[in-house]
């Protein structure tokens, strides 16, 4: 007499999360009586998928007639695939008894699930950073299958070279996770960039998943402090300009200062943007120079976006009298800058 | 080629509980079961325990009131827990691999962690 | 639970020499589907176990062919044809038929 043969035929099969997965089994005999049972995984902990005899399998239908006389296809058709369903399947038959005695399994078919990745998501940094300082950015994708994903970097359409990607598990799961670290050099014209991480895998069928991160959220963009005084009025007021240039994000505070003491304080608001995303503001101090006796030190102090003050101090001599007062321009200074201007009566 | 890396405290007092853990690199927890095994100073080998991939565990009845193995497959880890230690705990430790092919059967523990020494003392 | 009793409990040989050790169990490891569930493994000196046989005959990946396993139902043997010196540390058999896996008392060769 012939030994009975369980046959899977195939060794793996790959199916689509919420397709169906068809796996095969037959067996060489009607002999000796006794029902094919399925099971996911093998020794004491594996699961019955399906047994035609008993139980309720709803997910699981006979691909042909079991109840059919000869029938020798025992095989199975699984619905509505998720990733849990990964695994090894057994086709086993059983001697007829009490209870039914195993006799012989299948070789078993590996399943595989092909999962799509969720859409990137992109995090930055929790505080700003200046430009010319590095930050980084992570990207996230979760619960796909297989493993094998690729995942790119871009700033404003260039390539990012300088990322660390990870993929988790390290052996084979039921599905994986991605993260991907990407570090990026800001520069002062990067208000208006776009970092965008991109996720390439078998289930896209070439149309890749992007997640983005505005590096306006990320950046912090210091002002340029130009103060310039105007031409001496008739009236003996001196006009001086603080110039706040290229500054991001909106939110500055101004403060004028005569002889230390606060003159004015102004706060940015309804700012027109500038083509490369920052903006410029300019405040107006008037200074009578006839109602002092002494010098005047005038201070423009500018607080942007919570960042220690930045200060332009000048003085108002009193006791020269020139009547032809030029423009006098302080150059770009981070600290403190004084200057003379001379200033009189008349 | 599969590793198997156990980590945890090499002191434990008596009464508190032992936490190990065991992590597996380079392979795939799918299609296999994660045994404890552990071998007290100059004697044999004991079995405490097994997962599944599923989550299904298998205790040893003389420690199973004591011993919870659990499976982490986003890390790629299985712990075990053993509560209420006693002198009689101290032993080498071992995390393993354990095959199953066909039937209700198993095919080989054929990966060991190199075990970690565990002392019960006050 | 199944007991497994091993003999001898230690073993003297010579490098070169055949060498056998017994295995047997409280009831059949013998399953139905034909397959007998005894496993053999080595724990070298300061070292883990190692994987020998399993189902009783066949031999794990990397092991030498000095190594074989006999038996079915409650009596099991382990040969080595020819014994080396790296053979030495304490060989054990354990079923794996059903939980709790239980191991026996353990055999330790040493050379002679």
């Known amino acids: 007499e012939e030994e009975l043969q369980v046959i899977q035929p195939e060794k793996s099969v790959s199916v689509a999360a919420g397709d169906s997965a068809t796996l095969n089994c037959t067996v060489s005999s009607l002999i000796p009586v006794g029902p094919i049972q399925w099971f996911r995984g093998a020794g004491p902990g594996r699961e019955l998928i399906y047994n035609l005899k008993e139980g309720h399998f709803p997910r699981v239908t006979a691909v042909s007639d079991p109840t059919k006389r000869n029938n020798m296809d025992f095989s199975i058709r699984i619905s509505n695939i998720t990733p849990a369903d990964a695994g090894t399947y057994y086709c086993v038959k059983f001697r007829k008894g009490s209870p039914d005695v195993e006799l012989k399994s299948g070789a078993g078919t590996e399943l595989s699930v092909r999962a799509k990745p969720s859409a990137p998501v992109v995090s930055g940094p929790a505080v700003r950073a200046t430009a010319e300082h590095t930050v980084s950015f992570t990207c996230e994708s979760h619960g796909f299958s297989p493993r094998d994903i690729t995942l790119k970097w871009f700033k404003n359409g260039n390539e990012l070279s300088d990322v660390q990607t990870n993929v988790d598990p390290a052996g084979k799961s039921v599905s994986y996770s991605i993260r991907s670290t990407a570090r990026v050099l800001l520069t002062r014209r990067d208000v208006h960039s776009q970092v965008i991480c991109e996720v390439a895998h078998v289930t896209l069928q070439g149309d890749p998943l992007r997640g983005t991160a505005n590096l306006s959220e990320a950046i912090r963009v210091p002002p340029f402090l130009e103060v310039t005084q105007q031409s001496m009025r008739a009236d003996n007021q001196v006009n001086v300009t603080c110039q706040v240039t290229k500054f991001y994000p909106q939110r500055l505070q101004l403060t004028w200062l005569e002889n230390g003491n606060v003159s004015r304080t102004e706060m940015a608001s309804a700012l027109p943007e500038n083509k490369d995303g920052t903006y410029n503001w300019t405040s107006w101090l008037l200074v009578n120079v006839s109602a002092h006796r002494d010098d005047v030190k005038l201070t423009c102090q500018v607080e942007h976006d919570g960042q220690p003050a930045v200060n332009k101090s000048f003085s108002v001599k009193v006791s020269a009298h020139p009547k032809e007062q030029g423009s006098n321009t302080a150059a770009e200074n981070t600290g403190t800058n004084e200057r003379n201007i001379y200033g009189g009566s008349g | 080629q599969v590793q198997l890396q156990e980590s945890g405290p090499g002191l434990v007092r008596p009464s508190e509980t032992l936490s190990l853990t065991c992590t597996v690199s380079g392979g795939s927890i799918r299609n296999y079961y994660w045994s404890w095994i552990r071998q007290p100073p100059g004697k044999g080998l004991e079995w405490m325990g097994f997962i599944y991939d599923n989550g299904r565990t298998f205790y040893n009845p003389s420690l199973k009131s004591r011993v919870t193995i659990s499976l982490d497959m986003s890390m790629n880890q299985f712990s075990l827990k053993m509560t209420s230690v006693t002198a009689a705990d101290t032993a080498v430790y071992y995390c393993a691999r354990v095959r199953a092919y066909s039937g209700i059967g198993l095919d080989g523990t054929d990966v060991w962690g190199q075990g970690t020494t565990v002392t019960v003392s006050s | 639970d199944i007991v497994m009793t091993q003999s001898p409990l230690s073993l003297p040989v010579t490098p070169g020499e055949p060498a056998s050790i017994s295995c047997k169990s409280s009831?059949?490891?013998?399953?139905?589907?034909?397959?007998?569930?005894l496993d053999w493994y080595l724990q070298r000196p300061g070292q883990s176990p190692q994987l020998l046989i399993y189902?009783?005959?066949n031999r794990a990946s990397g092991v030498p062919d000095r190594f074989s396993g006999s038996g079915s139902g409650t009596d099991f043997t382990l040969k080595i044809s020819r014994v080396e010196a790296e053979d030495v540390g304490v060989f054990y058999c354990?079923?794996?038929?059903?939980?709790?896996?239980?191991f026996g008392g353990g055999t330790k060769v040493e050379i002679k």
């Open positions: 354990m079923q794996a038929l059903q939980t709790p896996l239980t």
């Open positions: 189902q009783g005959s």
């Open positions: 009831q059949s490891l013998l399953y139905s589907n034909g397959y007998a569930y």
